[in-house]
Interface confidence: low
């Protein structure tokens, strides 16, 4: 399927809106400090050269690769140099090593302040004054912030800000209506970006044999009345997309999930009979819904997998055969009978039948040395279950906030070298696993709380790698990407750990905490609560719930006072003393 | 049923180039890896080259590098692999496998390099 001009093939498949958008997202992707302004006019000059392609394919140019087009706009930029420094560097290289550079230099947690949402009226004025400029303006805000962020999704994100706006721009109460859509859209956001950040490392570290693995237990999940080799065809096409999207491709992602999204719709009936309600939407929708969509019914009869996967005597001559093939449809087969179990568990059970039988198929009795294998699973199976189990009574128990700060502890007694602001955010965030799971019923608390567990261990993994500071962090996050969150649970307190130096400056406070919001006023605490157990790795729960009491009195009387500053002046030092003493 | 039958092979000078060919049917060929394997007459298997699904990424033994390449048309799902350069050593029964196994399914294609 070549076409004389891929990038007119590209406009023509995607039309004029949607190629613009994703163009400004790939520009905000790679040139995350580029101004607004800059990159609107690098977009209207690749769109117009894109038209002219339109008109006559055999036109000066038409005929590049996109990377070259894109590649070649992006090293126009005049401040290249000052702004990126060393990434300037990429535009002396051919393709495709630019663009492999352009990719290597995108950074997970560039430096941009954070965004601050204005009054509504200021908003609604905004919007109506120029509402493609508006949305644009979200796009690049967006995509330079989550430089992985799934394009074609990120359109979708794009029309319902849209229309939340639209809506509530006219409503009586307009902060009534609009606050909640935008804090919606933006916790979405922040979950679509990280999910999509976990699939782009799977596949840049662990390669598309990993992602494809990750794939067929996901959508065999989903699908179970799916035949294995309809499934098998879904996620030759799935990985394309995520290849595309993970690798700076964002029109060819976009158009081939477009395809993939007519594809599902076309062929429900081998698919699943939940996909009805997602195929009547238009195309952002449509393939949002496809993504998200709940799992199937499992069929009624199927068999017991011991036939054909251990008392089968052809176990050895069908691995030999076609290792991979017989490995995915094991894999299919046990990830269509166990919707309760996570991926990760899957893939790791998957993982332990192939190792078994690498070692069994060279044994002098095959058939006797892998007879038990399945009773191997059991310890991999439970060993999840007991830690939902666990978790959740302690979330149960103590709250999201008091819960959150057991994990910034136990973490923090982990990997002691990671900086504050990464223990606390993915300490928070690994928190809210509570809130999201524990209330679902005991077949759904697996699947959700091991892969959200992953995608926020996959943050901390991408972080870290930005500035290695453990190599504990670093074992888990590289050896096996499966066994990433057991790696992480099964760490212990550091004991090579050299305690940081008490800083009285880290616990001075002043009384502009009291004009921070609730969820600012706990970040400020819980960067307290790592910074005394980086001082003191082996204090007490008791004792530093002690501490922690004694900061929130302090922090409240002080809020109260009628002279603010004075009281954290004075009372800060006492707070200061006190805590040394007890953690002495 | 997986299947896999190469062709090609045959009786070639020193310096001289051969092009193998793998047809693949019974499974997605497009979704997986693909690799050449050879056996000298007693010896084991010899793992040659890879490829991945994508056919993006190739792989080759130190002993071929540089004189061989693989290659796939995913349409027709074959695997190909150019022989150049060919030594008497690189005499072997050729076969092409499923990822990076050294299984074989197929019968092979023989590869005689002789004066």
């Known amino acids: 399927d070549t076409h004389k001009s891929e990038v007119a093939h590209r406009f023509k498949d995607l039309g004029e809106e949607h190629f613009k958008g994703l163009v400004l997202v790939a520009f905000s992707q790679y040139l995350q400090q580029c101004p607004f302004e800059e990159h609107v006019k690098l977009v209207n000059e690749v769109t117009e050269f894109a038209k002219t392609c339109v008109a006559d394919e055999s036109a000066e140019n038409c005929d590049k690769s996109l990377h070259t087009l894109f590649g070649d706009k992006l090293c126009t930029v005049a401040t290249l140099r000052e702004t990126y420094g060393e990434m300037a560097d990429c535009c002396a290289k051919q393709e495709p090593e630019r663009n492999e550079c352009f990719l290597q230099h995108k950074d997970d947690n560039p430096n941009l302040p954070p965004l601050v949402r204005p009054e509504v009226d200021v908003m609604c004025t905004a919007f109506h004054d120029n509402e493609a400029t508006f949305l644009k303006k979200y796009l690049y805000e967006v995509a330079r912030r989550h430089p992985y962020f799934y394009a074609p999704e990120l359109l979708f994100f794009a029309a319902r800000y849209k229309a939340a706006f639209a809506e509530c721009c006219q409503a009586a109460d307009k902060a009534a209506c609009l606050l909640p859509k935008l804090d919606e859209l933006r916790d979405e956001g922040k979950a679509s970006s990280a999910k999509q950040r976990l699939k782009c490392a799977s596949l840049q570290k662990f390669g598309d044999r990993a992602f494809k693995a990750w794939a067929v237990a996901r959508l065999s999940q989903k699908f179970p009345k799916a035949e294995f080799a309809e499934v098998s065809k879904l996620v030759t096409d799935l990985t394309k997309v995520h290849t595309e999207c993970c690798h700076g491709d964002l029109l060819e992602c976009a158009d081939d999930r477009a395809d993939l999204a007519k594809y599902m719709c076309e062929n429900q009936d081998s698919i699943s009979s939940k996909l009805k309600e997602c195929c009547d939407k238009p195309l952002l929708e449509k393939s949002h819904c496809l993504a998200e969509v709940e799992n199937d019914e499992m069929p009624a009869d199927l068999p017991s997998l011991a036939a054909d996967y251990v008392e089968s005597k052809d176990v050895c001559k069908n691995y030999a055969e076609a290792k991979d093939v017989f490995l995915g449809m094991f894999l299919y087969e046990y990830a269509r009978r166990h919707p309760d179990y996570s991926v990760m568990l899957l893939l790791r059970l998957a993982k332990a039948y192939e190792a078994t039988l690498e070692k069994c198929c060279a044994a002098a009795d095959p058939h006797e040395c892998y007879a038990k294998v399945f009773d191997e699973f059991q310890p991999l199976v439970e060993e999840p279950q007991n830690l939902v189990k666990q978790n959740c009574e302690l979330f149960e128990q103590l709250g999201e906030y008091k819960f959150q700060n057991a994990l910034l502890v136990r973490y923090t007694k982990k990997v002691p070298q990671v900086s504050t602001p990464t223990l606390v955010e993915v300490s928070r965030n690994l928190g809210k696993v509570g809130a999201k799971c524990c209330k679902l019923p005991e077949a759904k608390r697996m699947p959700c709380a091991e892969d959200y567990l992953s995608v926020v261990l996959n943050r901390l993994c991408v972080l870290h790698e930005k500035t290695p500071v453990s190599e504990k962090v670093t074992k888990c996050c590289t050896e096996s990407l499966v066994n990433r969150r057991p790696c992480f649970s099964a760490l212990e307190l550091d004991e090579a750990y050299v305690p940081k130096a008490f800083n009285a400056e880290t616990f001075t406070f002043h009384a502009d905490m009291c004009t921070l919001s609730e969820k600012e006023k706990q970040v400020k605490k819980q960067t307290a609560l790592v910074e005394l157990v980086k001082h003191k790795p082996k204090a007490t729960k008791e004792q530093l719930k002690g501490v922690m009491d004694n900061f929130a009195a302090f922090v409240e009387k002080c809020c109260k006072a009628d002279d603010k500053e004075a009281c954290f002046a004075e009372e800060g030092p006492k707070f200061v003393a006190a805590s040394q003493a007890a953690l002495a | 049923q997986v299947q896999l039958v190469e062709s090609g092979g045959g009786l070639v000078q020193p310096g001289g180039s051969l092009r193998l060919s793998c047809a693949a049917s019974g499974f997605t060929f497009g979704s997986f890896g693909m690799s050449w394997v050879r056996q000298a007459p007693g010896k084991g298997p010899e793992w040659v080259s890879a490829i991945d699904s994508g056919g993006g990424d190739t792989r080759y033994a130190e002993s071929v590098k540089g004189r061989f390449t693989i290659s796939r048309d995913n349409a027709k799902k074959t695997l190909y692999l150019q022989m150049n350069s060919l030594k008497p050593e690189d005499t072997a029964v050729y076969y092409c496998?499923?990822?990076?196994?050294?299984?074989?399914v197929g019968q092979g294609t023989q590869v005689t390099v002789s004066s």
């Open positions: 496998t499923i990822g990076r196994s050294t299984s074989r």
